[in-house]
């Protein structure tokens, strides 16, 4: 058997650190057997069998010029093997961050804090931490660890499914290369890392006969689970074209009527979501949707609310993008006490 321990990495490659002494091991001989060493492609002897170093070649203060392939041979000239030297650095603790787009799953991503220059892999696991008593700072023995399954194709991400919203988790990401391993531990709670995906299906429509009104509607992000236990609240921004500043409102439901649009101008609208109890942070903004207020005249009679709604409200099904959920407030009425003021303005 070979006297050379096989480091993790491709076969036939041995590793060292720049500026340090490096020992190369001749793989095809018995431990301690004296060998001769050559640099592949160079005939001069690097180290003879009389060095007293047996099957090892010692390179003092290795540098990049020492990288490459070496040949070792036995006393009678038989090939003992070829060894490729690659220089690099031991792992440093990786940079790790975790995020959750819903309250049941979270993902963690990582990146090296230093480039090692060597083949590198990552071991990812997590354990659940539970608190003993409301006031106690002591922790119970952790449960787990369990592997945090990594995305295929080498994406630096792993996903924890079926997490508990009220639990704390300790994430372990260990960077491993042939020169060692280094671990980053990160404590996370879903509450603090929750950031929903932006709302979907944003539509902006004019309100016939009301030149300063736009109606925006949207749905929950598809990634948000369909149980009604955890609701989202929303923030809507709008602005006329070429206007630098956004106006912001916090709608009560899945639609909002803008009543101070600029007549005749297209308006950009975007919407963001957050857990309704303020866990985590606001989502990124949805893609902008555009709409232009109606330019038509107002109807002679002000229709009732039900007639204005061209699409009847239907409670969405479980598999629809918007989850069934209780309304926190009644839907905003399209016509309110401000209507007459606006009508006067329009008729003036």
């Amino acid at each position: 058997s070979s006297p050379c321990p096989q480091a993790w990495g491709p076969p036939g490659v041995q590793y060292g650190q720049p500026g340090r002494s490096v020992k190369l091991c001749c793989p095809g001989v018995t431990a301690g057997d004296p060998v001769s060493w050559f640099r592949d492609g160079e005939p001069k002897l690097l180290q003879g069998p009389d060095s007293g170093l047996g099957h090892e070649l010692v390179l003092a203060q290795a540098d990049s010029t020492d990288e490459g392939t070496y040949i070792c041979q036995t006393l009678d000239g038989a090939l003992g093997g070829t060894v490729t030297l690659q220089l690099g650095y031991p792992p440093a603790r990786p940079v790790v961050s975790c995020q959750a787009a819903d309250y049941e799953n979270f993902s963690c991503t990582w990146s090296p804090s230093q480039i090692s220059g060597l083949p590198t892999r990552y071991l990812t696991s997590y354990r659940k931490k539970t608190v003993l008593g409301a006031d106690s700072q002591r922790r119970s023995p952790s449960t787990g660890p369990w592997p945090c399954p990594q995305d295929p194709l080498g994406a630096a991400r792993c996903v924890v499914h079926g997490a508990e919203f009220w639990s704390q988790y300790r994430i372990n990401v260990t960077e491993v290369n042939p020169l060692g391993a280094s671990t980053r531990l990160l404590d996370v709670s879903l509450q603090s890392i929750l950031r929903p995906d932006p709302p979907q299906g944003l539509r902006v429509e004019s309100v016939p006969g009301y030149p300063r009104r736009l109606r925006a509607s949207w749905t929950y992000p598809a990634s948000w689970p369909c149980q009604p236990h955890f609701l989202l609240k929303f923030r809507l921004q709008y602005r006329p074209a070429q206007h630098p500043a956004w106006s912001t409102v916090e709608p009560a439901g899945l639609e909002e009527v803008i009543t101070d649009a600029v007549a005749g101008l297209p308006h950009a609208v975007r919407v963001s979501a957050r857990d309704f109890l303020d866990a985590g942070t606001w989502s990124t903004w949805s893609p902008e949707a555009w709409g232009t207020p109606s330019t038509g005249t107002i109807p002679k009679e002000i229709p009732a609310w039900g007639q204005l709604h061209t699409q009847p409200e239907v409670e969405p099904q479980v598999d629809s993008p918007a989850p069934p959920r209780p309304s926190l407030q009644p839907h905003p009425r399209l016509l309110d006490h401000r209507d007459s003021v606006e009508q006067v303005a329009v008729l003036a």
């Epitope: 005939p43 001069k44 003879g48 041979q73 000239g77 090939l79």
Partner: antibody, heavy 117, light 107 residues
Framework: QVQLVQSGAEVKKPGASVKVSCKAS????????MHWLRQRPGQGLEWIGN????????HYNQKFKDRATLTVDKSTSTAYMELSSLRSEDTAVYYC??????????WGQGTLVTVSS | DIVLTQSPATLSLSPGERATLSCRAS??????LHWYQQKSGQAPRLLIK???QSISGIPARFSGSGSGTDFTLTISSLETEDFAVYFC?????????FGQGTKLEIK
């Protein structure tokens, strides 16, 4: 015991090619480099090149790089040296030699190649 | 290419005498110098490797010394079978090259 048995003498015309064989026995063929050398009548030794024991990697003397080709047939433990575009000054005894990377420890008996019109 | 110059071209000595053969390299080659013996009609035979390292099966009367550019092969007490041609060879850089040889003949 280690033996290297080379093919017989050859007479070639200028411009022709010659292929000399060297059959090895008595050792594990793929563990040792095989070198090729030549010695012109009354002259010193010239190294032509070597071929790696297992991966057929070669090093050539630039003087012969464009005309010499070293190959091995591992299944028969035989090494070959082909020299093309022969000229009269290629008349020499050609040797195969088992060695390490740079030394010649065991030699074949030699093959006389005569180039004459 | 590294040029090896051997001297003398011919050395005439009697059995029992000490023979000193020289090989000079055109540039420093550390200890990457080897010695071969070739008898008439035979293939060469390795005597000394890396300037001074002995080879199994070679009589102890053969020894080598030197480093850098100047090397010596010494035969402490000549035997009849030692009269032959001796070549030095360098392995410091490609191509591997030989000296032109020193012919050791019986006086």
């Amino acid at each position: 015991q280690v033996q290297l048995v080379q093919s017989g003498a050859e007479v070639k015309k200028p411009g022709a090619s010659v292929k000399v064989s060297c059959k090895a026995s008595g050792y594990t063929f793929t563990n040792y480099w095989m070198h090729w050398l030549r010695q012109r009548p009354g002259q010193g030794l010239e190294w032509i090149g070597n071929i790696g024991p297992s991966d057929s990697k070669t090093h050539y003397n630039q003087k012969f790089k464009d005309r010499a080709t070293l190959t091995v047939d591992k299944s028969t433990s035989t090494a070959y040296m082909e020299l093309s575009s022969l000229r009269s000054e290629d008349t020499a005894v050609y040797y195969c030699a088992r060695g390490d990377y740079v030394l010649f420890t065991y030699w074949g008996q030699g093959t006389l190649v005569t180039v004459s019109s | 290419d590294i040029v090896l110059t051997q001297s003398p071209a011919t050395l005439s000595l009697s059995p029992g005498e000490r023979a000193t053969l020289s090989c000079r390299a055109s540039q420093s080659i550390s200890n990457n110098l080897h010695w071969y013996q070739q008898k008439s009609g035979q293939a060469p035979r390795l005597l000394i490797k890396y300037a001074s390292q002995s080879i199994s099966g070679i009589p102890a009367r053969f020894s080598g010394s030197g480093s850098g550019t100047d090397f010596t092969l010494t035969i402490s007490s000549l035997e009849t079978e030692d009269f032959a041609v001796y070549f030095c060879q360098q392995s410091y850089s490609w191509p591997l090259t030989f000296g032109q040889g020193t012919k050791l003949e019986i006086k």
